[in-house]
Interface confidence: low
């Protein structure tokens, strides 16, 4: 059998095989050693017994999409049946005190490969034997501790394969410079050591994408924005746009990156080299946001020009070049760089919102029959922007971290946006008060630290006589600058 007979029926064209040469990979026309690495079709009953105690699942992931020329990394993780794990020696053991369908196991080992390798082999002193080889016959690399690696992973894509000896998790990186753009399929077959041969335990495949566009994601956040999952923001407050370029292999690390913004509100184009920008919309409505990212990326070097033919007489200087059939972004410059572009578009809605909230006065409420531990306090609050429909008060410890009491209630506020919120405090001490005003689209927060003094009849009486007292009579109030950011994430893959 050949590798392509074993590793799946995705057969790329001859063109694909020729033009997608992966560095360090081999052609799937090579022969597969079926004696050492048996091949089972889907549905073969032997799969059921390929692993003690159930089936092993291989989970294949990649950091796709990859910009052409960058590295794409694939990770395979083996998920063992319940109560099984790989130990430091690469053996598969039962987890202590873990009960599965078969109950607690007396034997600590599912597979004790250390014992097998010690008493097997008849090797020649080098640790090399006829069975320490990959399916194509290449010997295992002898890294330190290689004997503790008991799984053989065969990766297959674009008519080529890559073999790797590993433990229960392996990682393979591939350079995409020669990979055709678009979706491609990666298939992985995993074998486990079995005496002097190997047994297939799992197969998995996933699609990855190679693109000539820079993968761009934008997160949008705004103070007081209530819902982080709609694309609705508030008028007259800056929105922070943060651009994330998906570049896990750091291909663009040394590239100059330009960001060209159009916010759709007739403010013109804004060009920046900073990945973060703030913009404030001053009108309500729906706006089309457009971003173009440009990076000078490493690209293939153009072939050197052929030597000029020996002219019979001196040549005149050349005129302007004709139209280049390549797009502008595709023309490598002398430094072997290509302009790559990424695009992001979103439609965002701008509405009125509560822009700011302030506590302008804090007053102790005189109770004619004061409770032993209870104080009532009135907070006089103003706001700017739209009219709130609810008020929430969270009372917590002085660090503002441990909530002691939270109350939300609907509120009816006039155009002046002036309201009084009355809250009870149990006992003296210092409290953090978070006061939030909200409507359908916005949530505005302010915070204050207050000190509630010890209650005694004299202080209540003195306050009553002084006409209710002001803030400075009975409290120390400290305003905390505290803005809650609700991050708005654009959905991406």
């Amino acid at each position: 059998k050949r590798f392509h007979d074993v590793l799946g029926n995705e057969r790329p064209s001859a063109y694909m095989r020729e033009h997608n040469q992966l560095n360090g990979w081999s052609s799937d026309e090579n022969d597969w050693n079926e004696k050492l690495y048996p091949v089972w079709k889907r549905g073969d009953m032997r799969w059921k017994n390929s692993w003690k105690g159930g089936r092993v699942q291989a989970v294949l992931t990649s950091d796709s999409p990859a910009l052409v020329g960058s590295n794409i990394t694939f990770v395979v993780n083996l998920v063992f049946p319940r109560c099984q794990k790989e130990d430091a020696n690469g053996n598969i053991v039962y987890e202590k005190n873990c009960r599965n369908e078969a109950g607690l196991s007396a034997d600590p080992y599912v597979y004790n490969w250390t014992a097998w390798s010690e008493d097997s082999d008849g090797e020649n002193g080098t640790g090399q034997s006829h069975h320490n080889v990959f399916p194509d016959g290449k010997p295992f690399p002898h890294h330190p501790g290689w004997r503790r690696w008991n799984f053989v992973y065969v990766f297959h894509t674009l008519g080529q394969y890559f073999q790797k000896l590993g433990r229960c998790s392996v990682r393979v990186s591939v350079n995409t410079a020669n990979v055709t753009l678009g979706p491609q399929l990666m298939e992985v077959t995993v074998y486990r050591r079995h005496g002097r041969a190997y047994v297939p335990i799992a197969q998995v495949k996933d699609v990855y994408v190679v693109t000539d566009q820079i993968p761009v994601f934008v997160t949008m956040s705004q103070k007081n924005d209530r819902n982080s999952s709609d694309e609705t923001f508030l008028k007259d407050l800056p929105i922070t746009f943060d651009v994330l370029i998906h570049d896990p292999s750091h291909f663009l690390n040394y590239s100059t990156i330009n960001y060209k913004w159009s916010f759709g509100d007739n403010t013109g184009l804004f060009v920046s080299i900073n990945h973060t920008v703030n913009h404030t919309y001053v009108l309500n409505g729906t706006f089309s946001l457009n971003l173009t990212v440009k990076a000078a990326a490493p690209g293939p070097c153009p072939p050197p020009p052929p030597p000029p033919p020996r002219p019979p007489k001196p040549t005149p200087s050349l005129g302007p070049a004709g139209d280049n059939p390549l797009g502008l972004s595709e023309i490598p410059d002398e430094n072997c760089q290509i302009n790559r572009y990424g695009h992001f578009q979103a439609t965002i809605t701008i509405v009125e919102g509560i822009l700011e909230v302030n506590i302008i006065q804090t007053t102790d409420v005189l109770m004619l029959v004061p409770g032993p531990d209870s104080s009532l306090i009135d907070f006089v609050v103003t706001c700017q922007g739209s009219i709130p429909t609810e008020v929430c008060t969270i009372i917590s410890d002085p660090t503002c971290e441990i909530t002691q009491n939270a109350v939300c209630s609907p509120v009816d506020v006039d155009e002046m946006c002036l309201l009084t919120v009355r809250r009870a405090f149990n006992g003296s001490g210092t409290y953090c008060v978070n006061l939030t005003l909200g409507d359908d689209t916005s949530l505005a927060l302010t915070s204050t630290l207050i000190s509630v003094p010890d209650r005694d009849p004299a202080s209540s009486l003195r306050m009553a006589n002084s006409g209710g007292g002001g803030l400075n009579d009975i409290f120390e109030a400290q305003k905390i600058e505290w803005h809650e950011h609700h991050h708005h994430h654009h959905h991406h893959h």
Epitope: P65, D206, V209, H493
Partner: antibody, heavy 119, light 111 residues
């Protein structure tokens, strides 16, 4: 082999809360890159995605149902659950739990459980 | 939300003949050159079963007679030679954006 099994009452009264649990076997619901979804299908109609809980615990709901839906999980039991409040006859459906691998596709489904909303 | 529209609603095809189902999305479901479009088969009393993902990649254990094609907003599921066991309802589904949305389904019967 990964299996999902829905459980819960088959009959719920209008205005009450529908509660279902999906028990997962063969894989931990905290295994990387998987999302665990609820999907429903009214009798004789198409499929509607309700929401999912990611392996990390992040939850996303269908905006059309968001105000009524709660999805939770119990990793010790390898289960995730659905609650749908203030139900009406329009919520009568076969409710499926399903798994999807990152953003690609729903590859494993439960057998489904029919929930009827009726007084 | 992205709206998925399938046509036809139902389809009657002779055994051994080709069946073609179309799916149209209200906006492109392509992302960096790949169509985030899946096809499922559902038989009565059973949950849906994945047939095709990423517009054209066959799911595990799916017979070769099922194939998918298309990009952007227009996608097609083809059954090259209809078998008796293929009688079912077929759904397309986009996975590009949350919420994932399904087409209304196409019922395939034997003529």
């Amino acid at each position: 082999q990964v299996q999902l099994q829905e459980s819960g009452p088959g009959l719920v009264k209008p205005s009450e809360t529908l509660s279902l649990t999906c028990t997962v076997s063969g894989i931990s619901i905290t295994t990387g890159n998987y999302r665990w979804s609820w999907i429903r299908q009214p009798p004789g109609k198409g499929l509607e995605w309700i929401g999912y809980i990611y392996y990390s615990g992040t939850i996303t709901y269908n905006p059309s149902l968001k105000s009524r839906v709660t999805i939770t999980r119990d990793t010790s039991k390898n289960q995730f659950s659905l609650e749908l409040s203030s139900v009406t006859a329009a919520d009568t459906a076969v409710y499926y739990c399903a798994r999807d691998l990152t953003h690609w596709y729903f590859d494993v489904w439960g057998q489904g459980t029919l929930v009827t909303v009726s007084s | 939300d992205i709206v998925m529209t399938q046509s036809p609603d139902s389809l009657a095809v002779s055994l051994g003949e080709r069946a073609t189902i179309n799916c149209k999305s209200s906006e492109s479901v392509d992302y960096y050159g790949i169509g985030f479009l899946n096809w499922y088969q559902q038989k009565p009393g059973q949950p849906p079963k994945l047939l095709i993902y990423a517009a054209s990649t066959q799911g595990s254990g799916v017979p070769d007679r099922f194939s998918g094609s298309g990009s952007g907003t227009d996608f097609t599921l083809t059954i090259s030679s209809l078998q008796a066991e293929d009688v079912a309802v077929y759904y397309c589904q986009q996975s590009k954006e949350v919420p994932p949305t399904f087409g209304g389904g196409t019922k395939v019967e034997i003529k």
